[in-house]
Amino acid sequence: SGTTNTVAAYNLTWKSTNFKTILEWEPKPVNQVYTVQISTKSGDWKSKCFYTTDTECDLTDEIVKDVKQTYLARVFSYPAGNVESTGSAGEPLYENSPEFTPYLETNLGQPTIQSFEQVGTKVNVTVEDERTLVRRNNTFLSLRDVFGKDLIYTLYYWKSSSSGKKTAKTNTNEFLIDVDKGENYCFSVQAVIPSRTVNRKSTDSPVECMGQEKGEFREI
């Protein structure tokens, strides 16, 4: 159904990282505008991005209300300048998005190594606990607050003089690893949610190496 001079949106795609969630679609509008609606499986539809000429809509504010819910969105197409116009069935043209469950599907953002400190033959590496847009009691929650022990970090570490990457894992934001005395090491971390079947890994953090500003060395 729909008017003859509007086309339905297509390629509806969720783009979500650390719960910042945008719905994208095609085509770029020609003589038409879009409105987006979002709902949980059991909830009412809520309209967002009214009569927009954009082909994306930020739905973060809606999905952060309950990141474990499954959401569905739909994009309505209206003739530009005549948004009251409806199709032959008395309803504007629309297309449904795939279902989206933020907790299971949001991409893990690139982590950052906050600091590393060497004490003798041990190095403590700390990963920054990134803030998300999920709120509880008017406070923004960190990634660790949201995922708890479901979130682990994998540390890759290697001697500056070699290429083989050793690994360590933690379900906190800290690693304590053994290193060889007198050797400089480089570090990179990856966030992982092992219980997922897709989107399990983040991209790697920027590499940080000993002998650079971020670290601290203490000989004991």
């Epitope: 890759y156 990457k165 990856q190 992982v192 092992p194 399990r200």
Partner: antibody
Framework: EVQLVESGGGLVQPGGSLRLSCAAS????????IHWVRQAPGKGLEWVGY????????YYADSVRGRFTISADTSKNTAYLQMNSLRAEDTAVYYC?????????????WGQGTLVTVSS | DIQMTQSPSSLSASVGDRVTITCRAS??????VAWYQQKPGKAPKLLIY???FLYSGVPSRFSGSRSGTDFTLTISSLQPEDFATYYC?????????FGQGTKVEIK
Amino acid sequence: EVQLVESGGGLVQPGGSLRLSCAASGFTISDYWIHWVRQAPGKGLEWVGYIDPYNGYTYYADSVRGRFTISADTSKNTAYLQMNSLRAEDTAVYYCARDYGSLQVFIDYWGQGTLVTVSS
Amino acid sequence: DIQMTQSPSSLSASVGDRVTITCRASQDVNTAVAWYQQKPGKAPKLLIYSASFLYSGVPSRFSGSRSGTDFTLTISSLQPEDFATYYCQQHYTTPPTFGQGTKVEIK
């Protein structure tokens, strides 16, 4: 269903090369880690090395470092073990295996193995 | 590298027996120890992970425990299909290392 299928084994002369393949199905290799483990005839299990197909990071056992190279083609969902400068002591069944990647579970699925014989 | 010393290297037992296999780590590995079962000509199968957790589909007669750096695999009542070789493995640090294996044979 998760499956790992190795291929490429066979008879090779000392000093020769061989490339083993590990074709994965039922999961995406870039979401996990892939290990190679070998077992000489009548002997125990020996870890060879791993790859994180997502970023290409690898690490090898001392016994094979500099001779063996692990790689992955995520578009084919396949990992590889390139073995150069082969020695008689490399004769073994070679298994590829999936690392679940959690703190608790390590290797949860293994391939059926492929036999590599190094002999003149 | 961390050494995993497994004992005994072999044992003979009868159906219904309680069987215990031990692995000692050369240094602290926390609970990052798995146990695998391997039958001749077959790939290993995961039995126990994180020292004491039973992997999905594994019979409850298998159990694992930890005491410091000592890890134990127990089969409470040996069944005919349990005659196989068992390996422990630590994955606390890279490289991961296996025990030498314990062959459980029919008495």
